[in-house]
């Protein structure tokens, strides 16, 4: 018998990218970050 | 919510063509990993599946009836349709159609099926 | 094709009691890509048939927990903990790993 069609088997977890920007006062600039998951990776 | 309603002749003679149409809300056809089948009972008997269709026209039959059967979609419509031909008295049954997912979120099994629709075939 | 023999193909119960329906496939139904399509689907009187667990052992959405289902290879269980009286009907197992996607037979639930 021939297969039906499924997924690879894989569950993908969505996760949300959050980007942001923190001001640390006028004479330091900015902090740009890259949030995955809760955890800041860039 | 998903809903799903199926609809067809009623009754028809034996030879002729039976066409079935299954409109169905609350999901789209242009999603990716979605797709309609179709599941026949008689009266007093079990299930027997015979198709199904996915987003990307994808089709699958039930090979002992492939011969005579033909699925296909109106995604705008949100409609799959079921063309059995020459059909016989045998055919009579209750014709459900169901959703079924590709993917995780959608479940991958038939998660919602319509109310079903009566056809007997008569001479 | 695959064919789904379910056991017993009727059962009563008293209302409380467990519930246990067997159904067995021909050949394994493991797909290829590592999930077993092992469907339990409840048709009530008059009704289409609604999921109840699908991949063996996941429950769908609003599913009571005295729901269950269990197995491998060819050799699927489910089981009701307590039997109520919105449960009665005809329970199904089906297999969507392989064309053609197959039903068992039924089983009866029904009161003693």
């Known amino acids: 018998d021939a297969e039906f069609r499924h997924d690879s088997g894989y569950e993908v977890h969505h996760q949300k990218l959050v980007f942001f920007a923190e001001d640390v006062g006028s004479n330091k600039g900015a902090i740009i970050g890259l949030m995955v998951g809760g955890v800041v990776i860039a | 919510q998903v809903t799903l309603k199926e609809s067809g002749p009623g009754i028809l003679k034996p030879s002729q063509t039976l066409s079935l149409t299954c409109s169905f809300s609350?999901?789209?056809?242009?999603?990716?990993?979605?797709?309609v089948g179709w599941i026949r009972q008689p009266s007093g008997k079990g299930l027997e599946w015979l198709a199904h269709i996915w987003w990307d026209d994808d089709k699958y039959y039930n090979p002992s009836l492939k011969s005579q059967l033909t699925i296909s979609k109106d995604t705008s419509r949100n409609q799959v349709f079921l063309k059995i031909t020459s059909v016989d008295t045998a055919d009579t049954a209750t014709y459900y159609c169901a959703r079924r997912g590709l993917y995780y979120g959608n479940y991958d099994a038939m998660d919602y099926w319509g109310q079903g629709t009566s056809v007997t075939v008569s001479s | 094709d695959v064919l789904m023999t379910q056991t017993p193909l009727s059962l009563p119960v008293s209302l409380g009691d467990q519930a246990s329906i067997s159904c067995r496939s021909s050949q394994s139904i493991v797909h290829s890509n590592g999930n077993t399509y092992l469907e339990w689907y409840l048709q009530k009187p008059g009704q289409s048939p609604k999921l109840l667990i699908y991949?063996?052992?996941t429950r769908f959405s609003g599913v009571p927990d005295r729901f269950s289902g269990s197995g491998s290879g060819t050799d699927f269980t489910l089981k009701i903990s307590r039997v109520e009286a919105e449960d009665l009907g005809v329970y199904y197992c089906?297999?969507?790993?392989?064309?053609?996607?197959?039903f068992g037979a039924g089983t009866k639930l029904e009161l003693k």
């Open positions: 991949k063996v052992s």
């Open positions: 609350g999901f789209s056809l242009s999603t990716a990993g979605m797709g």
């Open positions: 089906f297999q969507g790993s392989r064309v053609p996607l197959t």
